[in-house]
Amino acid sequence: MSANATLKPLCPILEQMSRLQSHSNTSIRYIDHAAVLLHGLASLLGLVENGVILFVVGCRMRQTVVTTWVLHLALSDLLASASLPFFTYFLAVGHSWELGTTFCKLHSSIFFLNMFASGFLLSAISLDRCLQVVRPVWAQNHRTVAAAHKVCLVLWALAVLNTVPYFVFRDTISRLDGRIMCYYNVLLLNPGPDRDATCNSRQVALAVSKFLLAFLVPLAIIASSHAAVSLRLQHRGRRRPGRFVRLVAAVVAAFALCWGPYHVFSLLEARAHANPGLRPLVWRGLPFVTSLAFFNSVANPVLYVLTCPDMLRKLRRSLRTVLESVLVDDSELGGAGSSRRRRTSSTARSASPLALCSRPEEPRGPARLLGWLLGSCAASPQTGPLNRALSSTSS
């Protein structure tokens, strides 16, 4: 046992973290109960919200480049929300990871995958919008749903690639008080002769790389894209921002507010190796900012609905559709709906960046709705006049 433990060395900050005792303070225990309740609620909300967004955007809306971005963002958030119940369980059992090392690695990887995917996708959305305004002709010819899906696949692959070190260096470490931590152990692989230096360099490398790749670079891309679009639209005399602009602004703001504190504390934690005085501050703050980062996945669907009135309308109609499908008689099904169904070509041009917030005509009659529902998500509601009228250079 002892020899085995010696074979798995720990960085000083991790060793000292393992000494932190569970709270005996009653008021802190109340905070713990509240945290479990809050995370439990967030888990439920996140799963339902993102599931509904995926259904509404993926199935009830005409597939455009914009809906593709939102679809992938919602998928990333759904993944994060799906891991939240396990984090809630970790809190509920007294901040102890009782689900094993493999699941510890997987659970943490989902958190980081969501972090990278969100940053990359928001960058892509901003660049896409920038291209529409700055290179309208190019965008008209090359902006397709298929191309957007391909870009998303590449971004997912990059996100997975960036998540690998977090999967590799995640470990379960027993605390002094018997609880189990699921945390970084950067000495898991090739610790080298100078363990202190290895701890410092790897911790800094992880913190700085995730700050740059998942936060600073995406925000820089978003800011410069926004600046380029604003400059171009000023020349055209456009003033009022479009609905999609408001949606992107809200999602980006939420991303910055939710992930910013996490990255600050992550960098402080890396600094705490050389500056031990920072450790208590990091240990106090990290659980809160990690939760805040998780809550970004719960906030996004709310923002889609709040900044996009049409989303709410479609949401209501979709729920009504589901109820109708449950209540309708078998004889009413027929095949009328499916015969009139029109598939959206994967290479169809996206009419506008406002497609997510436009008002296409809804199919009428329960049979039509049910036929569409039974035809899974392939059926595309007809394009409305507003969508058709919008130019591809709208902001």
Epitope: L20, S174, L176, P276
Partner: antibody, heavy 122, light 107 residues
Framework: QVQLQQSGADLVRPGTSVKVSCKAS????????IDWVKQRPGQGLEWIGA????????HYNEKFKGKATLTADKSSSAAYMQISSLTSDDSAVFFC???????????????WGQGTSVTVSS | DIQMTQSPSSLSASLGERVSLTCRAS??????LSWLQQKPDGTFKRLIY???TLDSGVPKRFSGSRSGSDYSLTISSLESEDFADYYC?????????FGGGTKLEIK
């Protein structure tokens, strides 16, 4: 009250090994680390290493790796340090001490054993 | 390893006198420093931890302070039982290291 009771003084031959014990009482044994410290006359204090009795996880000073082996027995709430291949340099007083943590911080060596004198002589 | 330089190595003082011992860390230890007292019978007692927090049961005449990488132990008014050996200990990182010690003697 917290107490760390160490085994008595030992006179041992060079090349052999010695095992010093440290019996803990008055607290939850597995919730704290046990540190071991060496004191030689005129040479000050040297930290040998520490053991987490709950998991058996050990941390050694590089200088004492291969020389000292730390173990713990949860059932008897005792920690042990074995020193092998004894030489005259190993003649010293060895202390065990308790280290732990609070909710948001950690500390070291709040309680000490009375010390065990080990004399290596032929 | 972090080196702890303790001064003075020995100190003669009278009862009621105010004395200060200093420890300097070779690198940042962020306040993770304890002051230990070793009585003539060899037993150890921790007086201060986290640079300035007094242990329970330790008289108020003992106090700890920090100024950058310099840490001090001050005894405001010496009493007979205070004449002993004093050591500083850094526990910021492994391996823990001690100061060379200060022998406090009666003048």
């Amino acid at each position: 009250q917290v107490q760390l009771q160490q085994s008595g003084a030992d006179l041992v031959r060079p090349g052999t090994s010695v095992k010093v014990s440290c019996k803990a009482s008055g607290y939850a044994f597995t919730n704290y680390l046990i540190d071991w410290v060496k004191q030689r006359p005129g040479q000050g204090l040297e930290w040998i290493g520490a053991i987490h009795p709950g998991s058996g996880r050990t941390h050694y000073n590089e200088k004492f790796k291969g020389k000292a082996t730390l173990t713990a027995d949860k059932s008897s709430s005792a920690a042990y340090m074995q020193i092998s291949s004894l030489t005259s340099d190993d003649s010293a007083v060895f202390f065990c001490a308790r280290s732990g943590g609070s909710s948001f911080d950690y500390y070291a060596m709040d309680y000490w054993g009375q010390g065990t004198s080990v004399t290596v002589s032929s | 390893d972090i080196q702890m330089t303790q001064s003075p190595s020995s100190l003669s003082a009278s009862l009621g006198e105010r004395v200060s011992l200093t420890c300097r860390a070779s690198q940042e230890i962020g306040g993770y420093l304890s002051w230990l007292q070793q009585k003539p019978d060899g037993t150890f007692k921790r007086l201060i931890y986290a640079a300035s927090t007094l242990d329970s049961g330790v008289p108020k005449r003992f106090s700890g302070s920090r100024s950058g990488s310099d840490y001090s132990l001050t005894i405001s008014s010496l009493e007979s039982e205070d004449f002993a050996d004093y050591y500083c200990l850094q526990y910021a990182n492994y391996p823990y290291t001690f100061g060379g010690g200060t022998k406090l003697e009666i003048k």
